[in-house]
């Protein structure tokens, strides 16, 4: 048969941030194409990315149906131009992915500080509630909608004139912190899911400093 040149996919890897989820694999195809299937542990296989020469497949639409489920994918290899051909066992070569549970494993995307406002010796810092591709009732849910109180934010804040970073935490998207009067402060936030054992923290948000246009100062 024409399968002698067909090689199985390998290094199947899930790449997922805020539930945008792509399966990647190797090798770059030479005279072959791939089809991906995905299923939950108890569900039926669903085919995606039919006969593609890509080495990645966006599976977001499937995993967002239930982000707490555990998914398995497999990548089938077919000879180019002869996709009906099968392997010696009577079916095309395929390789299984590792299991993937989006709720536990999707990386937390870099957060953004939406605004900060100083009132006297207090500063209110607000974190943008990022939209995900998870839907409920035809509406896209925010990160907070999906994770609820499992998601916290850590705020790093420091005087512009010093390097030591103080921290504060919140399970909402707002911080209210005490600052010294007449001092300018800088801020950065990190998303954290403490209940996880891996992928617990996002990268830090871009640093925002007082005296820049995102903030507002009110003397009271």
């Amino acid at each position: 048969s024409g399968t002698t040149n067909t090689v199985a996919a390998y290094n199947l890897t899930w790449k997922s941030t805020n539930f945008k989820t792509i399966l990647e694999w190797e090798p770059k195809p030479v005279n072959q194409v791939y089809t991906v299937q995905i299923s939950t542990k108890s569900g039926d296989w669903k085919s995606k990315c039919f006969y593609t020469t890509d080495t990645e497949c966006d599976l977001t639409d499937e995993i967002v149906k239930d982000v707490k489920q555990t998914y398995l994918a497999r990548v089938f290899s077919y000879p180019a131009g002869n996709v009906e051909s099968t392997g010696s066992a009577g079916e095309p070569l395929y390789e299984n992915s590792p299991e993937f549970t989006p709720y536990l494993e999707t990386n937390l995307g870099q957060p953004t500080i939406q605004s900060f406002e100083q009132v006297g010796t207090k500063v209110n810092v607000t974190v943008e509630d990022e939209r995900t591709l998870v839907r409920r009732n035809n509406t896209f849910l925010s990160l907070r909608d999906v994770f609820g109180k499992d998601l916290i934010y850590t705020l790093y804040y420091w005087k512009s004139s010093s390097s030591g970073k103080k921290t504060a935490k919140t399970n909402t998207n707002e911080f209210l912190i005490d600052v010294d009067k007449g001092e300018n402060y800088c801020f950065s936030v990190q998303a954290v899911i403490p209940s996880r054992t891996v992928n617990r923290k996002s990268t830090d948000s871009p640093v925002e400093c007082m005296g820049q246009e995102k903030g507002e100062f009110r003397e009271i």
Partner: antibody, heavy 120, light 107 residues
Framework: EVQLVESGGGLVQPGGSLRLSCAAS????????IHWVRQAPGKGLEWVGY????????YYADSVKGRFTISADTSKNTAYLQMNSLRAEDTAVYYC?????????????WGQGTLVTVSS | DIQMTQSPSSLSASVGDRVTITCRAS??????VAWYQQKPGKAPKLLIY???FLYSGVPSRFSGSRSGTDFTLTISSLQPEDFATYYC?????????FGQGTKVEIK
């Protein structure tokens, strides 16, 4: 199993330097925060400083600011406490501890400690 | 910095006694208070987190409570292995701060 093991303590003269290590196993330090806490003989617990190993950001107690530096090597899963300009009052058992990082739980695992004696 | 004032600094009690240790924060720390037990030559061990929650593996005779900025650790019936030093700690703001400790000794 989560474990923290400190090493590098010993006898040092006033004005001298010492580097303590905190080797972590059972978890990845960049997913957490690492604190150093010390305890002078017969005294209570005193917080020294922390590091977020993911970004290298730190904060120190006033008593050690400018003399002590906390760093981390994520490839070795190890945090360090570099102590310079040591004084007699820095004599203590030094502990590293993992910060769980939630609103509710802070220092959930501690190392066994390493003794630093500053004396001429 | 927030001060945590712990009392008493030491107490003598007998096995079976009910023991209460208190900590007062110099300002609001919400429920971000932990209690640790330390035995001589050993590292502190977490007993209570978030003011009133028992940490995994800690016997149920230990309990914690909060009233405003006052925090209490109670041992309902003191056991021989409970003779140790106890510390409160706030982690509401940086720097985190500890109470001075309470040594529980055998009467």
């Amino acid at each position: 199993e989560v474990q923290l093991v400190e090493s590098g303590g010993g006898l040092v003269q006033p004005g001298g330097s010492l580097r303590l290590s905190c080797a972590a196993s059972g978890f990845t330090i960049s997913d957490y925060w690492i604190h150093w806490v010390r305890q002078a003989p017969g005294k209570g617990l005193e917080w020294v400083g922390y590091i977020d190993p993911q970004n290298g950001w730190t904060y120190y107690a006033d008593s050690v600011k400018g003399r002590f530096t906390i760093s981390a090597d994520t490839s070795k899963n190890t945090a360090y406490l570099q102590m310079n300009s040591l004084r007699a009052e820095d004599t203590a058992v030094y502990y590293c501890a993992r910060d769980y990082g939630s609103l509710e739980v802070s220092l959930d695992y501690w190392g066994q400690g390493t003794l630093v004696t500053v004396s001429s | 910095d927030i001060q945590m004032t712990q009392s008493p600094s030491s107490l003598s009690a007998s096995v079976g006694d009910r023991v209460t240790i208190t900590c007062r924060a110099s300002q609001d720390v919400n429920t971000a208070v932990a209690w640790y037990q330390q035995k001589p030559g050993k590292a502190p061990k977490l007993l209570i987190y978030s003011a009133s929650f028992l940490y995994s593996g800690v016997p149920s005779r230990f309990s914690g409570s909060r009233s405003g900025t006052d925090f209490t650790l109670t041992i309902s019936s003191l056991q021989p292995e409970d003779f140790a030093t106890y510390y409160c700690q706030q982690h509401y703001t940086t720097p985190p701060t500890f109470g001075q400790g309470t040594k529980v000794e055998i009467k």
